[in-house]
Interface confidence: low
């Protein structure tokens, strides 16, 4: 997170830290005791699928305070439409091997109903993004969990206000832009997969996933997030279905 | 709409203003009261805009110069009281007033619903947690707010 602040301990209780072979991989969002939402691109280069760990209740990576809960990732489900190395359909659903125990420091973020997300949450201007990613473009990652308030843009406005870059990916209907184009604040590498959380009438909801951008906090560019509302039914159907063998599963979308 | 005015001084009103064209000053002489004269004059000079009963759904009409005002019953709104307020209570309008989820129904009004772990309160719009750790709430902030001293 560039230009953010420390999320006070316990105030981002749905934040997940994903580790592979003990190393920081990505962020994620707890949506109930056994399921985590993250970004598909986090798993593009994974070889040791059985060494994926999700940590809940984490705050400061340099110390262990007893509120952390670690769980093996039993399954990673990615939409069949996602192509590794690209940006569209950048979402993954992770099933934990054992459920986490909900505490003051481990709480799920609400996965909203699609219509509510599209016609109400999408029009809430500011939302929070968080993670232990880089504090500057090409800089060091954070030890304490960082959080940043970002404004959401209509895709048309995002395109008009962004500098044209020849090989820039399209901003599809499965994405949205948020943040600032003045180079001051943005999510960054290492924050990928983490939550874009929107507050409405006293409750927080998952509206986006940290996905991609032109560098981090680059002048003339905004951060791009996976538009979670497009995947609500897909996620709900998968969470209701029987577990399938194998760690990586490509599930038909839509 | 202004029949009550005609009962006030029927003789002089007929003589001065019905049989012949009267001026505002002559009307003022008949009514001896500025407010009543004004009410009469609005209707007399440019016709009674309420004559066509433009106010719907039991609304009452007040004539104005070249226009009218409808006073609507509580359940209605709009220039002619043509809009049932409940028709505005739909999910695209401020989430239907619902705290969480809103459903529109054909033929009936919208209903509010809550996420798993919450239940609908008696007001029909608010949601209250039914579990210790409902999604989307931050326990340490909820507890901090709950223990704040109340203003007196």
């Amino acid at each position: 997170i560039v230009g953010g602040k420390v999320c006070p301990k316990g105030e981002c209780p749905w934040q997940v830290l994903l580790l592979v072979n003990g190393a920081q991989l990505c962020g994620g969002t707890l949506i109930n005791t056994i399921w985590v939402v993250s970004a598909a691109h986090c798993f593009d280069k994974i070889k040791n699928w059985r060494n994926l760990i999700a940590v809940l209740g984490e705050h400061d990576l340099s110390e262990h305070d007893g509120d952390e809960q670690s769980r093996r990732v039993a399954q990673v489900i990615i939409p069949s439409t996602y192509v590794p190395g690209t940006t569209n359909h950048d979402i993954a659903l992770l099933r934990l091997h054992q459920p986490v125990v909900l505490t003051d420091h481990v709480v799920p973020l609400c996965l909203p109903e699609r219509t509510f997300s599209e016609r109400t949450l999408a029009f809430v201007r500011f939302s929070l993004v968080s993670g232990w990613g880089q504090l500057l473009d090409r800089g060091a990652t954070a030890l304490e969990l960082m959080v940043l308030n970002v404004p959401r843009l209509m895709t048309q406005d995002c395109l008009q206000q962004s500098r044209k870059v020849g090989d820039s990916p399209n901003i599809t209907e499965y994405m949205f832009c948020a943040g600032y184009s003045d180079g001051s604040k943005d999510s960054c590498k290492g924050d990928s997969g983490g939550p874009h959380a929107t507050h409405y009438r006293g409750t927080w909801y998952l509206t986006g996933i940290v996905s991609w951008g032109q560098g981090c906090a680059t002048v003339g560019h905004f951060g791009v997030y996976t538009r979670v509302s497009q995947y609500i039914e897909w996620l709900q159907k998968l969470m209701r279905s029987e577990p399938r063998p194998g760690v990586l599963l490509r599930a038909p979308f839509p | 709409a202004n029949a009550f005015l005609e009962e006030l001084r029927p003789g002089s009103l007929e003589r001065e203003c019905k049989e012949e064209q009267c001026s505002f000053e002559e009307a003022r002489e008949i009514f001896k009261d500025a407010e009543r004269t004004k009410l009469f004059w609005i209707s007399y000079s440019d016709g009674d805009q309420c004559a066509s009963s433009p106010c719907q759904n039991g609304g009452s009409c007040k004539d104005q110069l070249q226009s009218y005002i409808c006073f609507c019953l509580p359940a209605f709104e709009g220039r002619n009281c043509e809009t049932h307020k409940d028709d505005q209570l739909i999910c695209v309008n401020e989430n239907g007033g619902c705290e969480q989820y809103c459903s529109d129904h054909t033929g009936t009004k919208r209903s509010c619903r809550c996420h798993e772990g919450y239940s609908l309160l008696a007001d029909g719009v608010s949601c209250t947690p039914t579990v210790e750790y409902p999604c989307g709430k931050i326990p340490i902030l909820e507890k901090r707010n709950a223990s704040k001293p109340q203003g007196r």
Partner: antibody
């Protein structure tokens, strides 16, 4: 015109389960509203037992929650009350009722059944 | 839970007189208060919802007022059929609760 009619045994033995059904006519139970059970012990006031919302969610009075189940059978346009482990204190007239649970109509009970008397006695 | 206290417990008046019934809530309930009338052997009947809105078909002599914690049901001129028990109901928060009732009897 919406009509509600309670039915069930008038006498229940202590420790058994009281079961009542409310049949709704003139209105589809699944289209909207909150469908409630309210009781009134002899010579006393009214006590709200709980409701089932048309979508299926329920809410019960905490004082009875551990013993109450309200369910709905949309195919028969009925909703039911089960109250377990009854004692003499559960002797009352039981009413089923409908409140139009919209914004601006906060559980005002506009429609009531005529009530059915239940005695708990051995 | 919200406790509703009605007063007086019994009110003795004659037809034609004005009746004023009170309902006090243990905490603020905005205007989420409803009034019911119950005659012997009958189910309650909704009179006033939302503190002051008459239910369908209720005569104009019945009116309600108040807000927050103090509420009043007024019957401007008593008719013989108005002698009954009157209950107020909290519609603000669960559990939904009723007052203990005011019995309006003929003097």
């Amino acid at each position: 015109q919406v009509q509600l009619q309670e039915s069930g045994p008038g006498l229940v033995k202590p420790s058994q389960t009281l079961s009542l059904t409310c049949t709704v006519s003139g209105y589809s139970i699944s289209s909207d509203s909150a469908w409630s059970w309210i009781r009134q012990p002899p010579g006393k006031g009214l006590e709200w037992i709980g409701y089932i919302y048309y979508s299926g969610s329920t809410n019960y009075n905490p004082s009875l929650k551990s013993r109450v189940t309200i369910s709905v059978d949309t195919s028969k346009n009925q909703f039911s009350l089960k109250l377990s482990s009854v004692t003499a204190a559960d002797t009352a007239v039981y009413y089923c009722a409908r409140s139009v649970n919209y914004y601006g109509n906060s559980f005002a009970v506009g429609y009531w059944g005529q009530g059915t008397s239940v005695t708990v006695s051995s | 839970e919200i406790v509703l206290t009605q007063s007086p417990a019994t009110l003795s008046l004659s037809p034609g007189e004005r009746a004023t019934l009170s309902c006090r809530a243990s905490q603020g309930i905005s205007d989420y208060l409803h009034w019911y009338q119950q005659k012997p052997g009958e189910a309650p009947r909704l009179l006033i919802k939302y503190t002051s809105q008459p239910a369908t078909g209720i005569p104009a002599r019945f009116s309600g007022s108040g807000s927050g914690t103090d509420f009043t049901l007024t019957i401007s001129s008593l008719e013989p059929e108005d002698f009954a028990v009157y209950y107020c109901q909290n519609g603000h928060s669960f559990p939904l609760t009723f007052g203990q009732g005011t019995k309006l009897e003929i003097k």
